[in-house]
Amino acid sequence: RRDVAHGILNEAYRKVLDQLSAGKHLQSLVARGVGGSLGGGAGDDAEPLSKRHSDGIFTDSYSRYRKQMAVKKYLAAVLGKRYKQRVKNKGRR
């Protein structure tokens, strides 16, 4: 039973670490300018990004990521592997 408890705790801890590393990954993408910056201009390198600015880019990268995930789900449902399962469910309605 103690092993099970440890397993559950480890799983929860791993999920937290995964979320943190995903956040770090997004931040590293932002730091490298992947996906384009929001406030792009000729004098971009004149001064470091303000926190609010970097938060804005982080949010933009995250929203792009969420959008891509939503599109992937849509494609799977209407053109891909989830379509057949949905057809079966439609038949049950």
């Epitope: 599109v71 992937k72 494609l75 449902a77 209407v78 891909g80 379509y83 057809v87």
Partner: antibody, heavy 108, light 109 residues
Framework: SVEESGGRLVTPGTPLTLTCTVS????????MSWVRQAPGKGLEWIGF?????SAYYATWAKGRFTISKTSTTVDLKITSPTTEDTATYFC??????WGPGTLVTVSS | AAVLTQTPSPVSAAVGGTVSISCQSS???????LAWFQQKPGQPPKFLIY???KLASGVPSRFKGSGSGTQFTLTISDVQCDDAGTYYC??????????FGGGTEVVVK
């Protein structure tokens, strides 16, 4: 079933909303897509609305269209129509059940 | 943006014969999420094949989809008069959604 309505002759720049009415379809379980077809031309995907009501658009369609829904209808608003928007507009559940389409003509 | 290029129209087929239509994508189709549709004049498109090779419900096994990555083919064997129409491929792209090919008209003689 799926059926589109609202198509008509409009002048350029006059916003127009098309409505897709569904029956026997739970819109909280299915994606709804909009596709258009200019006279004598091919199919063009506009975008879709998610089960939770979030809308996503083709790159070319962003800002030109708005998709929204209620429990039994899905709307497509053409924000500022141009003559290039003259087409038959189709609504589809997923992409396997399509309505007959509604014709929009944009002309001055 | 991704571009899907189909076999130029029209393509002729004899009743009982075989016809193939190609669909080439300018970039790789996400997870081979490619579909084929049939459309007849004055009607909405009909869903035939999904995920490149899987038959949609109620579609005769005479229709066969194949291919992967950027190159896909729809083959209709034992062609019937009712198969006349325009066929469209549609590819899924994770960054931009769905793109349709330009369509290929099949004429049955």
């Amino acid at each position: 079933s799926v059926e589109e309505s609202g198509g008509r002759l409009v002048t350029p720049g006059t916003p127009l909303t098309l409505t897709c009415t569904v029956s026997g379809i739970d819109l909280s379980s299915y994606y709804m897509s909009w596709v258009r077809q200019a006279p004598g031309k091919g199919l063009e995907w506009i975008g879709f609305i998610d089960t939770d009501g979030s809308a996503y658009y083709a790159t070319w369609a962003k800002g030109r269209f708005t998709i929204s829904k209620t429990s039994t209808t899905v709307d497509l608003k053409i924000t500022s129509p141009t003559t290039e928007d003259t087409a038959t507009y189709f609504c589809a559940r997923d992409l396997d059940l399509w309505g007959p389409g509604t014709l929009v003509t944009v002309s001055s | 943006a991704a571009v899907l290029t189909q076999t130029p129209s029209p393509v002729s087929a004899a009743v009982g014969g075989t016809v193939s239509i190609s669909c080439q994508s300018s970039e790789s189709v996400y997870s081979n999420y490619l579909a084929w549709f049939q459309q007849k004049p004055g009607q909405p498109p009909k869903f035939l094949i999904y995920e490149a090779s899987k038959l949609a419900s109620g579609v005769p096994s005479r229709f066969k989809g194949s291919g992967s990555g950027t190159q896909f083919t729809l083959t209709i064997s034992d062609v019937q008069c009712d198969d006349a129409g325009t066929y469209y491929c549609a590819g899924g792209y994770s960054s931009e959604g769905v793109a349709f090919g330009g369509g290929t008209e099949v004429v049955v003689k």
